[in-house]
């Protein structure tokens, strides 16, 4: 079973486009687009601060932090409405995720 | 980074026994933990897991047999009725993609009259 | 649900010989597959995962092949030390499952 070019191999991502933009009050904005080829019970996620395929039961049930999606040594919390989640770093840094 | 798990024991036949798995070196916030059976000169056996909102995914065949519960610190297995068959050693392991990279040492369950 | 069918149970080889051993999926894994080798008294330990990626520290001469239903895991040069039994173990959907385990005697 080969892969055709372009082709993903399956339950994994690539990411597609990276945008960085509008730095305002010392926060930078991130928008970022993957591509995924997930297995049956898949959707794409996060897991440790890149695209990856996750339970699609967590995506239904808005846990994020069930992915997760922050790297090893971060603490991970649920936005209020379940929004999204922050991941904060061990000396306090906070970096927050909104899902749209 | 390591597990251990503690709390194996020889019990009677319907005696509820709980294992503890305690890890050192990293946060069970940041994991899958699963727990893992094997009994004497078998094979492995996938109980269950648990996600760090405490969400479960049981085998089928250990589901109202068995509960996995957590704290910050510690994951939890209740062999709720145990049986001669649940004779075994019990392993916790912890996993980010499904594969189990990193082992507790095990501990032994011997149900017997 | 997946049922992981690994041969030989159990096998016998010599030292600086290969071993192959193999684990049959009933449903396409997608690569989803990972090898354990495990010594009496002991947990097991993590060889490879993905089917081929070997983990930090294993040596060289255990490889990992296969894709769909068809999954391989090589010793090539075996040693002394790699007598042990030997699971796969597939991660493509709940429930976890492993192959039953094959035995490896060195002479």
């Known amino acids: 079973q080969f892969l055709k070019e372009g082709q993903l191999a399956a339950g994994t991502c690539e990411i597609v486009t990276l945008d960085r933009c509008c730095n305002k009050n010392r926060r930078t904005i991130a928008r970022q687009t993957a591509r995924c080829a997930c297995r049956k019970g898949q959707i794409a996620g996060t897991t440790r601060a890149r695209p990856a395929c996750v339970d699609a039961r967590i995506i239904k049930t808005k846990q994020w932090c069930d992915m997760l999606p922050c790297l090893e040594g971060e603490g991970c919390d649920l936005l209020i409405n379940r929004s999204g989640w922050t991941c904060t770093q061990p000396g306090g840094r906070i970096k927050t995720t909104t899902v749209s | 980074q390591s597990l251990e798990e503690s709390g194996g024991r020889l019990v009677t036949p319907g005696t509820p026994l709980t294992l503890t798995c305690t890890a050192s070196?990293?946060?069970?916030?940041?994991?899958?933990m699963n727990w893992v059976r094997q009994a004497p000169g078998k094979g492995l056996e996938w109980i269950g897991i648990?996600?760090?909102?405490?969400t479960t995914y049981y085998a089928g065949w250990a589901k109202g047999r068995f509960t996995i519960s957590k704290t910050s610190t510690t994951v939890d297995l209740k062999i709720t009725s145990p049986t001669s068959e649940d004779t075994a050693t019990y392993f916790c392991?912890?996993?980010?993609?499904?594969?189990?990279?990193?082992w507790g040492p095990g501990t032994l369950v011997t149900v017997s009259l | 649900e997946l049922d992981l069918t690994q041969t030989p149970p159990s096998l016998s080889a010599s030292v600086g010989g290969t071993v192959t051993i193999n684990c049959l999926a009933s449903?396409?894994?997608?690569?989803?597959l990972a090898w354990y080798q495990q010594k009496p008294g002991k947990p097991p330990t993590l060889l490879i995962s993905?089917?081929?990626n070997l983990e930090s520290g294993v040596p060289p001469r255990f490889s990992g092949s296969g894709s769909g239903t068809d999954y391989t895991l090589t010793i090539g040069g075996v040693q002394a030390e790699d007598a042990a039994t030997y699971f796969c173990?597939?991660?493509?959907?709940?429930?976890?499952?492993f192959g039953a385990g094959t035995n490896v005697e060195i002479k």
């Open positions: 648990i996600y760090p909102s405490g």
């Open positions: 993905g089917t081929s």
């Open positions: 070196g990293f946060s069970l916030s940041s994991y899958y």
């Open positions: 449903e396409d894994i997608y690569s989803a």
């Open positions: 173990q597939g991660y493509s959907s709940y429930p976890l499952t």
């Open positions: 392991a912890r996993t980010v993609s499904g594969y189990f990279d990193i």
